[in-house]
Amino acid sequence: GSTVPPMVNVTRSEASEGNITVTCRASSFYPRNIILTWRQDGVSLSHDTQQWGDVLPDGNGTYQTWVATRICRGEEQRFTCYMEHSGNHSTHPVPSGNSHHHHHHHH
C-alpha cells in the first residue's frame, strides 16, 4: 500500500514528586517501520531510560506504537520526541500543563 504518515501525540502525566512521565504515541501509519525516541537537547536518550511499546496493527491496515520516559518537572523544554518514518522526520515538544499536541507529520 501507499505510505501513510503517522499521527504523533505527546502527553504528560504526574509521576513522582518533581517528576513527570512524557509519552509519545504514533498512530495510523504505514508501513510499520518507524523510529520513535525521546531526545534531550537534541540528543537521543539512552535506551535504558526509555520504555517502548510494540508496533501493533490498529485495525485499519495501519500501525501504532509509543515511547515514554520520565523527566524532571521544569525541564520540559529540553525534551522532544523524534519520529522517523519512510524517509521523513519530525520533532514534537512536551506540552505545557496537562494539554497534549497531536498532528500528522508533514516534512
Partner: antibody, heavy 116, light 107 residues
Framework: VQLQESGPGLVKPSQSLSLTCNVT?????????WNWIRQFPGNKLEWIGY???????TYNPSLKSRVSITRDTSKNQFFLQLNSVTPEDTATYYC??????????WGLGTSVTVSS | DIQMTQTPSSLSASLGDRVTISCRAN??????LNWYQQKPDGAVKLLIY???RIHSGVPSRFSGSGSGTDYSLTIANLEQEDVATYFC?????????FGGGTKVEIK
Amino acid sequence: VQLQESGPGLVKPSQSLSLTCNVTGYSITGDYAWNWIRQFPGNKLEWIGYIGYTGSTTYNPSLKSRVSITRDTSKNQFFLQLNSVTPEDTATYYCARWRNWAMDYWGLGTSVTVSS
Amino acid sequence: DIQMTQTPSSLSASLGDRVTISCRANQDISHYLNWYQQKPDGAVKLLIYYTSRIHSGVPSRFSGSGSGTDYSLTIANLEQEDVATYFCQQGNTPPTTFGGGTKVEIK
C-alpha cells in the same frame, strides 16, 4: 553546516583556556547539542561537554568542576572555558554538533599547548 | 564510564581488500554505537550511526553491525582515500566515550 574553532595556541599552567566555535549553515538555537571534544597526543578522544539549543549545558563529570560552555546566539557562536589548566590539558580541541545519536559535523580542530 | 576497546590498533591492507575493525564495550550499549573517520590532516567525519545506519554522503562500501557489547565496521573494498584512523563511540550511557582508534594504511 560548518564549524570552526579558534583560540590561543599556547596557555600557561594555572590559567584559563578559552576557545570559540563559529557555526555557519545552521542556527545553534534551532536544535541539537553543540559539543566540545578534545584529542590528546596519542589520539585518545575525550568528550568535554555541550550546550543544547535551549542553552542548557551538560558536562563530563571528570571535568565539571573546571569547565564552562556558553554561547552568543547573535553571532551563532559557542565557547569553551577550561580553568586551572595543566600540561595534561594539552590537546587538539574540536567542536561538533550532536544530532540525535551521533556527532554529524565536526570542526577541523585547534591545537592548544599548556606550557610555561 | 563505559570503556570502549578497539582492535586492531593499526592494520595494513591492499587496495580492494575487505577490512573489518572491531569495537567492544565493557557493558551493553544497546546499539548506540557510532563510527568516525579521521583523515591524516585531522578532519573528522561521521560514517555510521546507531550501529548500522550510513550517514548521508558516505560511500556504500562502509557498513556497520553488532549488538550488545560487540560491534564492527567493515570497508568492503578498500580505496586509497580510506587511509585514516577510525574511532568508535558509545552514546548510550553518559558520558559518551570513544575507542582508542584504528589506523588503516595501504600495503
